[in-house]
């Protein structure tokens, strides 16, 4: 079943997907599509990489991480309710039926009208190149410390940790960072 991620209308959504290149520079094509992963390719492609660059994208979709080291996590800018649904991250490993496929469910919630939250510590300044996902409300930020290369088996662990709301609350309350790996 799909792993679920949440974002509010108007926020940026973050859908994690990682692989470890077999050797430095041995990148493989990756596609992101709207809808569950089909047998081949991605349906309704929103972004695609080749062995070197992002070579196709549609507006509002980009890779903010170091995709040349295997961080092919998708950022969707300024989401609307229409962005809800299943997204497919497909690591297109050469060979017959070798692809790794991940279905991620994005749930978009209407924006809450809340008083201006107290200013949070600027994690990005403290930890450059960190990955941040917006959680259940404007004051909640789940933050992952500088991620090393993550192999394919670790992604489900990462996904489970990310979707655990108690973890999100702990992160918010303690200002902690998680180091995976």
């Amino acid at each position: 079943s799909e792993v679920e991620y949440r974002a509010e209308v108007g926020q940026n959504a973050y859908l994690p997907c990682f692989y470890t290149p077999a050797a430095p520079g041995n990148l493989v094509p990756v596609c992101w599509g709207k809808g569950a992963c089909p047998v081949f390719e991605c349906g309704n492609v929103v972004l695609r990489t080749d062995e070197r660059d992002v070579n196709y994208w549609t507006s509002r979709y980009w890779l903010n991480g170091d995709f040349r080291k295997g961080d092919v996590s998708l950022t969707i800018e300024n989401v609307t309710l229409a962005d809800s649904g299943i997204y497919c991250c497909r690591i297109q490993i050469p060979g017959i039926m070798n692809d790794e496929k991940f279905n991620l469910k994005l749930v978009i919630k209407p924006a809450k009208v809340t008083p201006a939250p107290t200013r949070q510590r600027d994690f990005t300044a403290a930890f450059p190149r960190m990955l941040t996902t917006r959680g259940h409300g404007p004051a909640e930020t789940q933050t992952l410390g500088s991620l090393p290369d993550i192999n394919l088996t670790q992604i489900s662990t990462l996904a489970n940790e990310l979707r655990d709301s108690r973890l999100a609350n702990d992160l918010r309350d303690s200002g902690a960072t998680i180091r995976i790996g």
Partner: antibody, heavy 120, light 107 residues
Framework: QVQLVQSGAEVKKPGASVKVSCKAS????????MDWVRQAPGQGLEWLGY????????SYNQKFKGRVTMTTDKSTSTAYMELRSLRSDDTAVYYC?????????????WGQGTTVTVSS | DIVMTQSQKFMSTSVGDRVSITCKAS??????VAWYQQKPGQSPKLLIY???NRYTGVPDRFTGSGSGTDFTLTISNMQSEDLADYFC?????????FGGGTKLEIK
């Protein structure tokens, strides 16, 4: 040391083709991409595309697709860029440049440039 | 295609100045921006890649910063040999694109 040595200046008529060569030395030719970039007189830089000698894979700027072909000769560590159906606005200095994973596919060594003049 | 905009075509500087050259991408390119220096009659030279990584042999007075859409090349202690054109490049997507360049001149 790494060197990229390009062929000499060319003067061509509109509609003709030009083929520029770039001989590489001082590194393993097949381990790096070869990008091609041009610069019109007094202007900025424009990327034409790249070739990966190891696999022969190419990626071209859509603006030039159908007019540009990039090839390599691994036996002589030479890359070639052919541009067809030349127009006056193709007048520029054409550069080959090496790029590799270590520098995130930015261009760390450049040829000296080949001036291509298109004039009737 | 991603458009890279260097809004200042020319900048007047003096030796010893701190100079900041800016570049704006039309969409987020993460950290995938490089900076090149080009002197008259010469080929471009790589200074900075992946936004802030100084290329081998580049003096440490050259510093790159920024991410997303806004990037800056800073020369902390301008030298006469730094008079040149400076180009930013996004190396995120194909086709790779360059800014129009910023020429440093002496006041």
């Amino acid at each position: 040391q790494v060197q990229l040595v390009q062929s000499g200046a060319e003067v061509k008529k509109p509609g003709a083709s030009v083929k520029v060569s770039c001989k590489a030395s001082g590194y393993t030719f097949t381990d790096y991409y070869m990008d091609w970039v041009r610069q019109a007189p007094g202007q900025g830089l424009e990327w034409l595309g790249y070739i990966y000698p190891n696999k022969g894979g190419t990626s071209y700027n859509q603006k030039f697709k159908g007019r540009v072909t990039m090839t390599t000769d691994k036996s002589t560590s030479t890359a070639y860029m052919e541009l067809r159906s030349l127009r006056s606005d193709d007048t520029a200095v054409y550069y080959c440049a090496r790029s590799g994973y270590g520098n995130y596919y930015t261009m760390d060594y450049w040829g000296q440039g080949t001036t291509v003049t298109v004039s009737s | 295609d991603i458009v890279m905009t260097q809004s200042q075509k020319f900048m007047s500087t003096s030796v010893g100045d701190r100079v900041s050259i800016t570049c704006k991408a039309s969409q987020s390119v993460g950290n995938n921006v490089a900076w090149y220096q080009q002197k008259p009659g010469q080929s471009p030279k790589l200074l900075i890649y992946y936004a802030s990584n100084r290329y081998t042999g580049v003096p440490d007075r050259f510093t790159g910063s920024g991410s997303g859409t806004d990037f800056t090349l800073t020369i902390s202690n301008m030298q006469s040999e730094d008079l040149a054109d400076y180009f930013c490049q996004q190396h995120y997507s194909s086709p790779s694109t360059f800014g129009g360049g910023t020429k440093l001149e002496i006041k």
